[in-house]
Amino acid sequence: IWELKKDVYVVELDWYPDAPGEMVVLTCDTPEEDGITWTLDQSSEVLGSGKTLTIQVKEFGDAGQYTCHKGGEVLSHSLLLLHKKEDGIWSTDILKDQKEPKNKTFLRCEAKNYSGRFTCWWLTTISTDLTFSVKSSRGSSDPQGVTCGAATLSAERVRGDNKEYEYSVECQEDSACPAAEESLPIEVMVDAVHKLKYENYTSSFFIRDIIKPDPPKNLQLKPLKNSRQVEVSWEYPDTWSTPHSYFSLTFCVQVQGKSKREKKDRVFTDKTSATVICRKNASISVRAQDRYYSSSWSEWASVPCS
Amino acid sequence: RNLPVATPDPGMFPCLHHSQNLLRAVSNMLQKARQTLEFYPCTSEEIDHEDITKDKTSTVEACLPLELTKNESCLNSRETSFITNGSCLASRKTSFMMALCLSSIYEDLKMYQVEFKTMNAKLLMDPKRQIFLDQNMLAVIDELMQALNFNSETVPQKSSLEEPDFYKTKIKLCILLHAFRIRAVTIDRVMSYLNAS
């Protein structure tokens, strides 16, 4: 058993049928010695008397808010949550496996640049009685500071019969140098509580590996005289690290017909312009990627050929 | 400590081409190592990230773009003195700071070159003959060093009398390649910045 926060405790259970559970001793936070009784949740049934209460915690029915009273007055509370260990592996019931970029990916994180700011998000099908708390650091043995905000519900989607909820959080490394070569990964820890179930999820990454630039901006077409060709031009996204000559991007320019089956023409360039043939009803898209370290491509920025 | 904005003559920056070749070569070598050594801990998540140049060179600091010198987090207190007769820019405008940066890069390359050659000698003794260093990568390191054209004492190749532990050698190869790839990215960024300045 360990304390999650004031008056909230997590009981770790080896979870299998007929498991013996864990013996837990609760102590009433009071100078009083006599006449103390204990109850669980809203029940008025007295579970025991005395300054301490010993309970055997086996299942969720044994978890909840234990309250000690004296003469009708509440003295203190202890909320017991359960953390299930199933065959040596902590349960992951609360969050959905996003399966990207690999199986058992519960937290996904992205950064728009090298400033040390990043966003993480996760999915769940649970809509109520759910709380998250996020902590982060650079490295784990001698952790350096990363400050995270509160997790917020950022999207709701319908998937088949189920509703899916996306939560996200923004974090910022306290003293980040965009040019630094990372040797210690960022660690992100999410505590999830659903009703009386506690779970924790972690992700470890280097900012360089989660970079995904914003799409190029100001995408424009300039027709070339007496030609089906057009000059496409664009700019670095505002959110990208500067100076751009140091934090350079490379670009992919794509000409896509109306039909998805039509052949796509693709050009790769380090410049912020390219000359392509603009077909009728086609559209031109451009996306960006760090020129020197192949992390994710940005989403496409698009303009119609007409 | 930082790079001033210099204006080299156009087409006078041979190092940019060499640094791009270097990044390509080390990335290919790392990919090959990860595939060949699939049963070894060779991914970024599994290895310890060690920098053999730590406390010996200070490339990131010495080559910091002018725009980032206002960022206190970028200004570490590591100071290292370097030889300052680089000729990569082939321009008299090469400042002391730029020379410090380029000489730091040169020292990095020299250290990695020695490590890779020592390691290759060990890998050649492996009866499994599982993996060797790409000669192209070693050649590209050499080419960039020549383009940087710094005079520096030659570091003798380390020789080891004890029987090599091939498992450990292959894991060290992965560690070195990961670190060298990161340094090659920094070198490429620096060369691109200098080229644009």
């Epitope: 049928p17 065959d87 040596g88 | 049963f39 599994e46």
Partner: antibody, heavy 115, light 112 residues
Framework: QVQLVQSGGGVVQPGRSLRLSCAAS????????MHWVRQAPGKGLEWVAF????????YYADSVKGRFTISRDNSKNTLYLQMKSLRAEDTAVYYC????????WGQGTMVTVSS | SYVLTQPPSVSGTPGQRVTISCSGG????????VKWYQQLPGTAPKLLIY???QRPSGVPDRFSGSKSGTSASLAITGVQAEDEADYYC????????????FGTGTKVTVLG
């Protein structure tokens, strides 16, 4: 005490269907994940499928994906394996089993796929 | 499809020490617990070892388990005639959990 009693096995022709059941007692069935494991005659153990305690997630071995469906009825304390498009290579003793460090197995039920 | 490799058979005379190896990789045994099962002919498997080296109550202490790196082993010290059975190791793969990974199985024969 924990008990898992299996039923539904038998002889079936290739391409036909069969549903296995596993009735649980002696524990809170709705709190625990459950597996199906099979063993072909003279062969080793092969995992078939898993279902979460609440039925929200199901996992299958590649060899049965798209043909077999694991399900549970927590109100009846019963686990099911619906097997469709059966093949000769599905011939095996099928076991249900609880998930956890200490597990409990059903007695097994024989499924023979033969023409 | 078996990722955990066991020797097909091992044998020993009563009283001898018999060991069975189970070889896997970094993503399975290297990062998860190992279990060992005993299966007597015509019966369901019986749990002998969980959590690499833990014995459930009721399992004789002549059975012991250990794990090192990407391999695990089961030892029977002072093997007895009733130990003649098939033995399976089991673990998970970190990418496919909760799918069970079973070893190829080992037939233990008690001679004499």
């Amino acid at each position: 005490q924990v008990q898992l009693v299996q039923s539904g096995g038998g002889v079936v022709q290739p391409g036909r269907s069969l549903r296995l059941s596993c009735a649980a007692s002696g524990f809170t069935f709705s709190s625990y994940g459950m597996h199906w494991v099979r063993q072909a005659p003279g062969k080793g153990l092969e995992w078939v499928a898993f279902i979460r305690y609440d039925g929200s997630n199901k996992y299958y071995a590649d060899s049965v994906k798209g043909r077999f469906t694991i399900s549970r009825d927590n109100s009846k304390n019963t686990l099911y394996l619906q097997m469709k498009s059966l093949r000769a290579e599905d011939t095996a003793v099928y076991y249900c089993k609880t998930h956890g460090s200490h597990d409990n197995w059903g007695q097994g039920t024989m499924v023979t796929v033969s023409s | 499809s078996y990722v955990l490799t066991q020797p097909p058979s091992v044998s020993g005379t009563p009283g001898q020490r018999v060991t069975i190896s189970c070889s896997g990789g970094r993503s399975n045994i290297g990062s998860n617990h190992v279990k060992w099962y005993q299966q007597l002919p015509g019966t369901a498997p019986k749990l002998l070892i969980y959590g690499n080296d833990q014995r459930p109550s009721g399992v004789p202490d002549r059975f012991s388990g250990s794990k090192s790196g990407t391999s695990a082993s089961l030892a029977i010290t002072g093997v007895q005639a009733e130990d003649e059975a098939d033995y399976y190791c089991q673990s998970y793969d970190r990418g496919t959990h909760p799918a069970l990974l079973f070893g190829t199985g080992t037939k233990v024969t008690v001679l004499g």
